[in-house]
């Protein structure tokens, strides 16, 4: 798990875009708002994040949705689906 640290000045992500590929894991944790991530999940799939960076994004979604992801997020998981465990998937209420 990435240590909680304050986001450096000027690094708060206003949107999910390719500039985030230069963020270290702790910066993604500190500077990307989970609710913003959830609403812009469709963008994640077009950005060449490393496997480790995807771990951080998954962790943020897990904190935002401890009971399971909503369908709006599930539909746009893309490569992040590879990070999902059977336990994660069992929480989903997919119709």
């Amino acid at each position: 798990e990435v240590e909680k640290t304050a986001c450096p000045s000027g690094k708060k992500a206003p949107e999910i875009d390719e500039s985030l590929i230069f963020y270290k894991k702790w910066e993604l944790e500190a500077c990307v708002d989970a609710a913003l991530l959830a609403t812009q999940m469709d963008r994640v799939n077009a950005i060449p994040f490393t496997y480790e960076q995807l771990d951080v994004l998954k962790h943020k979604l897990d904190e935002l949705y401890p009971q399971g992801y909503p369908e709006s997020v599930i539909q746009h998981l893309g490569y992040l689906f590879l990070k999902m465990s059977p336990e994660d998937i069992r929480k989903w209420n997919v119709t």
Epitope: I21, A46, I47, P48, F49, G78, Y79
Partner: nanobody
Framework: QVQLVESGGGLVQAGGSLRLSCTAS????????MGWYRQEAPGKERELVA????????NYADSVKGRFTISRDNAKNTVYLQMNSLKSEDTGVYYC?????????WGQGTQVTVSS
């Protein structure tokens, strides 16, 4: 699977220069968006230091701006990282990567050691 082979690393004094090369086996190399990453130590995170897209547009991590230059030679299927004014904190294994979503393949890397 595309093979990436990095080379050009070595031991250099602080303030010195090195030029790294990454050669790809893929014939459509010119279409690839490429990046160089640095890993300071085994088990530590690989940090992106520079990228170059197929049009030659470049981006750099703040820590290397003005010191490192990424370039490419599509005829040779090769991307380069010219590293000047090297610092001890630049020490690590350098890897190139095809910057493609869902691509997590890495070459063997090339070790750069900067002594102070």
């Amino acid at each position: 699977q595309v093979q990436l082979v990095e080379s050009g690393g070595g031991l250099v004094q602080a303030g010195g220069s090195l030029r790294l090369s990454c050669t790809a086996s893929e014939s459509g190399f010119s279409a690839n968006y490429m990046g160089w990453y640095r890993q300071e130590a085994p088990g530590k995170e690989r940090e992106l230091v520079a990228t170059i897209n197929r049009f030659g547009s470049t981006n750099y991590a703040d820590s290397v701006k003005g010191r490192f230059t990424i370039s490419r030679d599509n005829a040779k299927n090769t991307v380069y990282l010219q590293m000047n004014s090297l610092k001890s904190e630049d020490t690590g294994v350098y890897y190139c990567r095809i910057m493609r979503p869902g691509n997590w393949y890495w070459g063997q890397g090339t070790q750069v050691t900067v002594s102070s």
